[in-house]
């Protein structure tokens, strides 16, 4: 439940303007996302670690395009939408659809934003109206974060700044990508 | 009409805690970035924390495990728990809507006077 | 993380066009992040007047434009006004894209 207040629940999908996709809700439950059926791994995992840069998560690859008002993208953009649980690396499948997602029964890890990008796009505008460009932010890598609790447990320290620098030494994850990437118009977010 | 009203600015005593409020109006809260940007008193702008639309957080160096944003997509309200407050934390707090890697909005501020 | 600097104070008589210079520098002295320019008057909040180093939101007057060159970002003010007086900050984001800085600020006095 600690995650849901994290997330603020912002899962609504509807059409917006500006820069960022909500997660869409399905991904909550998506088959592609390989969690275990069983609800996780046994307890005294041989590969459970306390060390974050030994586990992976999910990059989902999504295409929209970017509105503001009336005006759209001539282009859709890719990003990545972090989500799913983060299991240790050498668990983790190469392809989407194959094999067990692996669960934590203990530590609190979840696939975060890693690294943003910024984007220049052209967007288009109806009645004749001159093309408007706008620099997008849009996500580029995610990484595994592990997630400390407050007292209270009703909310989860931050990331800080250094959570999406790109860390030099650190060894590349494995990403899972969908056979071909998802399109779809998700609610934009600035 | 894009609104922000912030509140909960007020006197308090070095290593004490304050809560700020931040109303928004007027747009679709839960699809913006959203920042707390602070002045102090006769000094420039700087940057404190903002907020993602999905509720990831990023600090300043300054206020990083003194200070924690938040927000509330159900009463389009964003926050700033203000803790082991300092001196120098004196100013008037800003929050701003992010879009578009720039501050379009801007509410009037509310003064935070740390003091004994 | 890039840090800014802006001429303390630039004054000009009403009629007259003023440049405000915004420099980068940062570890790696190049092309700045897209720079925002905000005006401040004296008790208000900030207004955003440039974005994207050169677009002005509706209702800016077309008397404010911006440009930058290398590490320089710059804000003109042409035909300059009474009203123009204030103070103006350039700002930036930060490599992550998570973070902002801003110049120190410059005071524009109109003579």
């Known amino acids: 439940q600690g995650w849901q207040a994290f997330k603020n629940d912002a899962t609504e999908i509807i059409p917006e303007l500006g820069e960022y996709p909500e997660p869409p809700p399905e991904l909550e439950n998506n088959k592609t996302m390989n969690r275990a059926e069983n609800g996780g791994r046994p307890p005294h995992h041989p590969f459970e670690t306390k060390d974050v840069s030994e586990y992976s998560c999910r990059e989902l690859h999504f295409t929209r395009y970017v509105t503001d008002g009336p005006c759209r993208s001539a282009k859709p953009v890719t990003e990545l939408v972090c989500s799913g649980q983060c299991g240790p690396a050498r668990l983790l499948p190469n392809a989407i659809g194959r094999g067990k997602w692996w669960r934590p029964s203990g530590p609190d890890f979840r696939c975060i934003p890693d690294r943003y990008r910024a984007q220049r796009v052209q967007l288009l505008c109806p009645g004749g109206e001159a093309p408007r460009a706008r620099k997008v932010r849009l996500v580029a890598s995610c990484k595994c974060k592990r997630l400390t609790r407050f007292h209270n447990q009703s909310e989860l320290k931050d990331f800080g700044t250094e959570a999406a620098r790109p860390q030099k030494g650190r060894k590349p994850r494995p990403r899972a990508r969908s056979a071909k990437a998802n399109q779809a118009e998700l609610e934009n977010a600035y | 009409q894009v609104q922000l009203v912030e509140s909960g600015g007020g006197l308090v005593q070095p290593g004490g805690s304050l809560r700020l409020s931040c109303a928004a109006s007027g747009f679709t809260f839960r699809s913006h970035w959203l920042s707390w940007v602070r002045q102090a008193p006769g000094k420039g702008l700087e940057w404190v924390s903002v907020?993602?639309?999905?509720?990831?957080?990023y600090y300043a160096d300054s206020v990083k495990g003194r200070f924690t944003i938040s927000r509330d997509n159900s009463k389009n309200t964003l926050y700033l728990q203000m803790n082991s407050l300092r001196a120098e934390d004196t100013a008037v707090y800003y929050c701003?809507?992010?879009?578009?890697?720039?501050?379009?909005?801007w509410g009037q501020g509310t003064l935070v006077t740390v003091s004994s | 993380d890039i840090a800014l600097t802006q001429p303390a104070s630039v004054s000009g008589s009403p009629g007259q066009s003023i440049t405000i210079s915004c420099t980068g520098t940062s570890s790696d002295v190049g092309d700045i992040n897209d720079v925002s320019w905000y005006q401040q008057h004296p008790g208000k909040a900030p207004k955003l007047m440039i974005y994207d180093v050169n677009n002005r939101p509706s209702g800016v007057s077309n008397r404010f434009s911006g440009s930058k060159s290398g590490n320089t970002a710059s804000l003109t003010i042409s035909g300059l006004q009474a009203e123009d007086e204030a103070d103006y900050y350039c700002s930036s984001y930060g490599e992550s894209l998570t973070s902002y800085v801003f110049g120190g600020g410059t005071k524009l006095t109109v003579l």
């Open positions: 907020t993602t639309h999905q509720g990831y957080t």
């Open positions: 701003a809507r992010d879009t578009y890697l720039h501050f379009d909005y």
